[in-house]
């Protein structure tokens, strides 16, 4: 009985043509949606003039269908038992699942102004930037449509820079018609306990963004894990969105459409400061913003974003230190809504339901030479938006799963 089931499972979770795993792996059978909530700034003038707390009001959800494209350039390597691929990016707006349209306007931080002032610290260069900011009538904040903010717009200030720079700015620009990877993952043929574990990403085993173990590409991409998952396991996975590997721990048993699954969650410890979690020392890359590595709950990924001061956190600064959220009014973190979880069917290791939640923030600092940042008295990690990417196994697939996997075991 059990041995036969194990043998069947081992055979069917291998990533090669003809297996159940492979079919669902190449093109996910699950509908995946990415919901966005934008933080609309209510008091831009007061912030710019008096360095007041930033008052934000979240607006959303604005929903896009994502991950509907099949993996590309899927290539098996029989020698090292790996399969390589590109994960193409695509997003389709879903008006019926959204509170408004892509043309809705938001008052948000001026991404180009914040980024340029951070990248170019030289005071003379900042004076040049100041001239261009003034000339383009740009300010610390800007009004942008959802479409512009997410997918890109031509920035008027950057358009005046007299040497070659990318003048298109957007939080996810470029996205459509791009791909993530190349990923090279173990196909499990020789060792099923390695199936779906990433061997290399973009041709490397390390990211080059972090020091020491923080730079490692660990585990899978979280879409699946090697089979026979135990509750005691710490599940490692790599997320290119946050430019790092992270981990999830068992939280509870959940029944998903009649299928027993394990709910694994990202623990607060993963976001802790090195003071509380020494393993995180290498995610602290500078001493000033992090208050000598005592701040927690925000991750500086600027090295992964061409120097732009992007900080990733959980929505509403969940699990973040009070100093991070103190300058921002209007945030209400709660675990249920804002944490990330994976519901994993333990026998196959497949993720049958997930909610990936993260927040994109941008650092803006006072600048003596940039007029629109001159009156700031403190640094702000400004929330721009948060997202909830979810997928749940469809009813038909769940029936199939129950009959072919869990039903056979029970």
């Amino acid at each position: 009985g059990d041995l036969l089931i194990q043998k069947t499972i081992k055979k069917q979770v291998v990533l090669e043509e003809g297996t159940i795993a492979f079919k669902n792996w190449v093109k996910t059978g699950t509908e995946v949606y990415r919901q966005f909530w934008i933080f609309d700034v209510q008091n831009p003038q007061e912030v710019m003039m008096n360095s007041s707390n930033i008052q934000v009001k979240q607006r959303g959800p604005y929903t896009y269908r994502v991950r509907f494209l099949a993996k590309e350039n899927v290539t098996q390597d029989a020698e090292d038992n790996t399969v390589s691929f590109l994960q193409p990016n695509g997003a389709i707006f879903e008006p019926s699942l959204s509170v408004g349209t892509e043309a809705d306007n938001f008052t948000v931080l001026n991404l180009a102004v914040a980024a340029a002032s951070h990248i170019y610290q030289n005071q003379f260069v900042q004076m040049i930037l100041n001239s261009l900011i003034n000339k383009s009538k740009s300010s610390m904040f800007q009004v942008r449509t959802l479409r512009e903010l997410l997918w890109g717009y031509r920035d008027p200030f950057l358009s005046l820079v007299p040497y070659p720079v990318t003048t298109t700015v957007g939080l996810f620009y470029p996205y459509n018609n791009t791909a993530d990877g190349v990923y090279k993952v173990f196909n499990g043929k020789d060792n099923i306990s390695k199936v779906a574990i990433i061997d290399t990403y973009k041709g490397k085993r390390n990211l080059s963004y972090w020091e020491s173990h923080c730079d490692m590409i660990n585990g899978t991409d979280a879409a699946s894990f090697p089979p026979f998952v135990e509750k005691s396991q710490v599940l490692q996975f790599f997320s290119s969105d946050i430019c790092r590997s992270i981990y999830a721990v068992f939280e509870s048993d959940v029944n998903l459409k009649g299928i027993p699954v394990y709910r694994f969650v990202l623990p607060s410890k993963a976001f802790a400061s090195p003071v509380e979690n020494p393993d995180n020392y290498c995610f602290c890359t500078e001493k000033i913003i992090s208050k000598n590595c005592t701040s927690y709950g925000v991750l500086d990924i600027s090295k992964c974003k061409e120097g732009r001061p992007v900080y990733i956190s959980l929505p509403h600064f969940l699990y973040a230190s009070p100093d991070v959220s103190e300058p921002i009014d209007g945030l209400n973190p709660n675990e249920e809504e804002h944490r990330t979880y994976l519901d994993i069917e333990p026998i196959t290791g497949f993720t049958l339901q997930f909610a990936k939640r993260l927040q994109v923030n941008l650092l803006v600092k006072p600048s003596e030479k940039i007029q629109v940042l001159k009156n700031l008295k403190r640094n702000y990690i400004v929330p721009i938006l948060w997202l909830n990417e979810t997928g749940t196994i469809g009813d038909e697939k769940a029936n199939m799963f129950r009959s072919q996997v869990t039903g056979k075991i029970n």
Partner: antibody, heavy 115, light 107 residues
């Protein structure tokens, strides 16, 4: 010790161009911008423009826009100021000077424009 | 453009005297004012930089004050070697602009 050494005096005809060099030593050239200032005989100081060798960022005073070109060669730690369409009122001592606060100055290059 | 109005254009003093030079700017420049001394045939020399900061090696008889639009440069206990032209420069915004200069003569 920081030193800025400029090229020698020049006599130029009206309508021609002049290129003044400024060789820096004693510090990492790309760490600081180079500014250019001129001083006509018996007159005050006038800022012409500046260049940041690291980023290539350049700013010119409106008065010189289109006539002055600033360049910097990181490999030789040398900054250059070229002024074209010279007229008699461009007769002056031209200085290169480091940073926003002009903390170190070259010895000056006298450019005489005369027919 | 920030214009800088420097006064007086000329002043005469005796050794041991105290003199002050004023620079007024057309816009608020915080404390981004610099002061220079220039002797005949020499390039200017930075005495005081932004934030009223006396440069290393500059005698303490030189000082400055001011913030916003009104700035004052002071020489206490004047010595004969202080005979020179003095210039102020605003480094808050582009274009960088100088005052017209003050000629200090020692009697």
């Amino acid at each position: 010790e920081v030193q800025l050494v400029q090229s020698g005096a020049e006599v130029k005809k009206p309508g021609s161009s002049v290129k003044v060099s400024c060789k820096a030593s004693g510090y990492r050239f790309s760490d600081y911008e180079m500014q250019w200032v001129r001083q006509a005989p018996g007159q005050g100081l006038e800022w012409m423009g500046g260049i940041d060798p690291e980023t290539g960022g350049i700013a010119y005073a409106q008065k010189f826009q289109g006539r002055v070109t600033l360049t910097a060669d990181k490999s030789t730690s040398t900054a250059y100021m070229e002024l074209s369409s010279l007229r008699s009122e461009d007769t002056a001592v031209y200085y290169c000077t480091r940073k926003l606060d002009f903390d170190y100055w070259g010895q000056g290059t006298l450019v005489t424009v005369s027919s | 453009e920030t214009t800088v109005t420097q006064s007086p254009a000329f002043m005469s003093a005796t050794t041991g005297d105290k003199v002050t030079i004023s620079c007024i700017t057309s816009t608020d420049i915080d404390d981004d004012m610099n002061w220079y001394q220039q002797k005949p045939g020499e390039p200017p020399k930075l005495l005081i930089s932004e934030g009223n900061t006396l440069r290393p090696g500059v005698p303490s008889r030189f000082s400055s004050s001011g913030y916003g639009t009104d700035f004052t440069f002071t020489i206490n206990n004047i010595e004969s070697e202080d005979a020179a032209y003095y210039y102020c420069l605003q480094s808050d915004n582009l274009p960088l602009t100088f005052g017209q200069g003050t000629k200090l003569e020692i009697k």
